[in-house]
């Protein structure tokens, strides 16, 4: 598998990851003790017809054409936990790996 | 998980997996020799915010709101396999699970 | 009803050609990969070869391949198989079948015997 | 290229009789494997497909069961017409392989 990686300067159009760092104390979400932040990355771009495609499905049903099907659009295609030290709500501390919170690799789909 | 499921006569304007059967001869796809069509479903719909979204991660990057961040778009969210033969271009015929090939879900990412 | 009705067969010399037909009817022939597969008198069952619905991609064993050529004629609903340079292991019956997952009809059958 | 064996190579049953035969491959091919049956002078006819799938018109006496190397078709009760020999034949990859066959005898 593949995918394109970005940053702020990058003048790529197509689907592509770029750096996102997500700030917990920003949010105002004192219930997550740590990280306060961490880098989460996010998907954005345009999926022309077959580049970055993850799924042969995605091939089949812009062959097919059904009414209503948009185009693929540019989405995570793997993603990582991390782990996390929070308050659940009920008096407790829990510390959990919380899965998909970083975007490790765009595609189309 | 969930995911709404839609035809052709549904009037629902959100996410949802329609059906949809794809057949390989009528797209002239000669080297599949098994199935001749399968039920492999799409995806289609408006994703507001929060409904339907897979990950905690697309909520999250809603929140930082970064640029060229597009909302989360209806994609499939569970997908499954399905068996098939078919020349492999070297002239062998090969019987695969070919994943990916039916959308069991679909969500908002 | 599916019907295949294998033809062609017959006595020949090791060395000889043959071309065996194989008609089909009942079904829509050019949707479905084709097949030929044999029986030595007394013996077991051997696949000799595969063709694509559109005839585009074909498939043999190494026991026939480059002497055995596999055809179709869409338009006329006949399955062939072209047998050069024959052998005495050849003698058989050969059979067509329709391909699915598995060969899901077969014809009747046709006797090539290679012989001095 | 993939070897198929089956097993027993001929069997004597009885009409009511639960018969089962196995086959096994050389190496993994999954549920691609295939079960015909031929009655002397005839041609094979096709019985289950895709390990346990039954082709249509085939009597539900017939299943078949397995993955991987081994498999077994069963007939549940053994009716007179099922006398016949039995090939199973693995469609993982070419070239196609069939199993030697077993004849199934009236005891």
């Known amino acids: 598998d593949f995918g394109l990686d970005c940053d702020e300067h990058s003048t790529e159009s197509r689907c592509c990851r770029y750096p996102l760092t997500v700030d917990f104390e920003a949010f105002g979400w004192d219930w997550i003790i740590a990280p306060k932040r961490y880098k989460a990355n996010y998907c954005s771009g345009e999926c022309e017809f077959v580049f970055l495609q993850k799924y042969p499905h995605t091939h089949l049903v812009h062959q097919a054409n059904p009414r209503g099907s948009a185009g693929p659009c540019c989405t995570p295609t793997k993603m990582s936990p991390i782990n996390m030290l929070y308050f659940n709500g009920k008096e407790q501390i829990i510390y959990g790996k919380i899965p998909a919170m970083v975007v490790d690799r765009c595609g189309c789909s | 998980d969930f995911g709404l499921d839609c035809d052709e006569h549904s009037t629902e304007s959100r996410c949802c997996r329609y059906p949809l059967t794809v057949d390989f001869e009528a797209f002239g796809w000669d080297w599949i020799i098994a199935p001749k069509r399968y039920k492999a479903n799409y995806c289609s719909g408006e994703c507001e915010f929060v409904f339907l979204q897979k990950y905690p991660h697309t909520h999250l990057v809603h929140q930082a709101n970064p640029r060229g961040s597009a909302g989360p778009c209806c994609t499939p969210t569970k997908m499954s396999p399905i068996n098939m033969l078919y020349f492999n271009g070297k002239e062998q015929i090969i019987y695969g699970k070919i994943p990916a090939m039916v959308v069991d879900r679909c969500g908002c990412s | 009803e599916v019907q295949l009705l294998e033809s062609g067969g017959g006595l020949v010399q090791p060395g000889g050609s043959l071309r065996l037909s194989c008609a089909a009817s009942g079904f829509t022939f050019s949707s479905y990969a084709m097949s030929w597969v044999r029986q030595a008198p007394g013996k077991g069952l051997e696949w000799v070869s595969t063709i694509s619905s559109g005839g585009s991609y074909t498939s043999y064993p190494d026991s026939v391949k480059g002497r055995f050529t596999i055809s179709r004629d869409n338009s006329k609903n006949t399955l062939y198989l072209q047998m050069n340079s024959l052998r005495a292991e050849d003698t058989a019956v050969y059979y067509c079948?329709?391909?699915?997952?598995?060969?899901?009809?077969w014809g009747q059958g046709t006797l090539v015997t290679v012989s001095s | 290229d993939i070897q198929m064996t089956q097993s027993p190579s001929s069997l004597s049953a009885s009409v009511g009789d639960r018969v089962t035969i196995t086959c096994r491959a050389s190496q993994s091919i999954s549920t691609a494997l295939n079960w015909y049956q031929q009655k002397p002078g005839k041609a094979p006819k096709l019985l289950i497909y895709?390990?346990?799938s039954l082709q249509s018109g085939v009597p539900s006496r017939f299943s078949g069961s397995g993955s991987g190397t081994d498999f077994t078709l069963t007939i549940s009760s053994l009716q007179p017409e099922d006398f016949a020999t039995y090939y199973c034949q693995q469609s993982y990859s070419t070239p196609w392989t069939f199993g030697g066959g077993t004849k199934v005898e009236i005891k």
């Open positions: 895709s390990a346990s």
């Open positions: 079948a329709k391909q699915d997952y598995a060969m899901n009809y």
